[in-house]
């Protein structure tokens, strides 16, 4: 048989987050190299990563078309080396992946407080609204502009004095809380899915803000802005 | 000895379409990977697209997917380059070629066909 | 994508001089496992599709005079053609196959002084 020498694919594993996505597999290769395949359940195959000697390969062009869709990719394994000396006429062999659907199984990527602002006894926490991949006209979209109200933030907030948390939800970028006069607060935030009933329904914690530090001093009577 | 001939060349007008055919003989043509490589007068070689032995897999330079395609029917030992939507940048000369001793080396190349595409 | 860059655009060499045509990668070519460079050197005759002169950087293909050598590793590449001959006048193109799109150098002039 030509195809003696190369071995399938297998764990192939999608990998996604923010849209960003790529399917990983083994074996590493000896004698071999790979050409990946990824279709829509309708759609024709389309090759990517061609004959490549890497064990992952970056999908995100093609599934950023329609975050919606669910695809599947296939992973052939090809001799190293003009297939002549391998004698090889026949089909390489192949595995398929598992369906992928990115808009419900794509990871949610650490969110970050972009600012807080003090009022008095209000504070304002914004969420950095992170771009994606995801095209519409030539311009890149947000989380935000393609999950739309699908995605809401969650708040952590505690007073730096104690470890008592409370939290506060939005589906916009914006929190508006009250706060004890006087008091310093930390803040993190959790994006959240609810409407996924899997392990990626929730991103991790974003880092932890806090009123007071050195990047800027919160005021009662003024505003304070943090940015990274 | 290998040989590699191409047909299907032309002058056509900005949009329209044309195949080109790559006849391929001395070698046995299913067990090798193609290409089709182009030359606008007076300039480089820019590689066009790849089809696998098998025929299954194929890859194309950004200039022309979606607009070409390539494919090969190892029954006839021949490789064919449709080319639809065709722009004035088309204009070269078309080479087939195979691969040799790895993928993308090309041992033989054919004498090419040119394609004008003028209105 | 990987960028090939060739120097000179152009060169004038007398007969039985030597000629040397340097090509840069974008990126290294090189693949660590085998630790192989992904690069071959054509020769373009005028009315002629190239020929395959040298591949892995330095290997010979059958058939080719041993005035053409090929060196260098990672992103910096040269042909040397050691005595040049009448024969050699014709233009020479760097390719890198290491991963697709292939990409080739715009390509050098070769020419007798």
């Known amino acids: 048989s030509g195809t003696t020498n190369t071995v399938a694919a297998y764990n192939l594993t999608w990998k996604s987050t923010n849209f960003k996505t790529i399917l990983e597999w083994e074996p590493k290769p000896i004698n071999q190299v790979y050409t990946v395949q990824i279709s829509t359940k309708s759609g024709d195959w389309k090759s990517k990563c061609f004959y490549t000697a890497d064990t992952e390969c970056d999908l995100t062009d093609e599934i950023v078309k329609d975050v919606k869709q669910t695809y599947l990719a296939r992973v052939f394994s090809y001799p190293a080396g003009h297939v002549e000396s391998t004698g090889s006429t026949e089909e390489p062999p192949y595995e398929n992946s598992p369906e992928f659907t990115p808009y419900l199984e794509t990871n949610l990527g650490q969110p970050t407080i972009q600012s807080f602002e003090q009022v008095g006894t209000k504070v304002n926490v914004t969420v950095q609204d992170e771009w994606t991949l995801v095209r519409r006209n030539d311009t890149f979209l947000s989380l935000r502009d393609v999950f739309g109200k699908d995605l809401i933030y969650t708040l952590y907030y505690w007073k730096s004095s104690s470890s008592g948390k409370k939290t506060a939800k939005t589906n916009t970028n914006e929190f508006l809380i009250d706060v004890d006069k006087g008091e310093n607060y930390c803040f993190s935030v959790q994006a959240v899915i609810p409407s996924r009933r899997t392990a990626n329904r929730k991103s991790t914690d974003s880092p932890v803000e806090c009123m007071g530090h050195e990047k800027g001093e919160s005021r009662e009577t003024g505003h304070h802005h943090h940015h990274h | 000895q290998v040989q590699l001939v191409e047909s299907g060349g032309g002058v056509v007008q900005p949009g329209r379409s044309l195949r080109l055919s790559c006849a391929a003989s001395g070698f046995t043509f299913r067990s090798y990977g193609m290409h089709w490589v182009r030359q606008a007068p007076g300039k480089g070689l820019e590689w066009v697209a790849v089809?696998?032995?098998?025929?299954?897999?194929?890859y194309y330079a950004d200039s022309v997917e979606g607009r070409f395609t390539i494919s090969r029917d190892n029954s006839k030992n021949t490789l064919y380059l449709q080319m639809n939507s065709l722009r004035a940048e088309d204009t070269a000369v078309y080479y087939c070629a195979r691969d040799g001793v790895y993928y993308g080396v090309y041992d033989y190349w054919g004498q090419g066909t040119l394609v004008t595409v003028s209105s | 994508d990987i960028v090939m860059t060739q120097s000179p655009d152009s060169l004038a060499v007398s007969l039985g001089e030597r000629a040397t045509i340097n090509c840069k990668s974008s990126?290294?070519?090189?693949?660590?496992?085998?630790?192989?460079?992904?690069l071959a050197w054509y020769q373009q005759k005028p009315g002629q599709p190239p020929k395959l002169l040298i591949y892995w950087a330095s290997t010979r293909e059958s058939g080719v005079p041993d005035r053409f050598s090929g060196s260098g590793s990672g992103t910096d590449f040269t042909l040397t053609i050691s005595s040049l001959q009448a024969e050699d006048v014709a233009v020479y193109y760097c390719?890198?196959?290491?991963?697709?799109?292939?990409?080739f150098g715009g390509g050098t002039k070769v020419e007798i002084k």
């Open positions: 990126q290294s070519v090189l693949f660590s496992s085998n630790n192989k460079n992904y």
């Open positions: 089809i696998t032995y098998d025929g299954i897999n194929k």
């Open positions: 390719q890198q196959f290491h991963s697709y799109p292939l990409t």
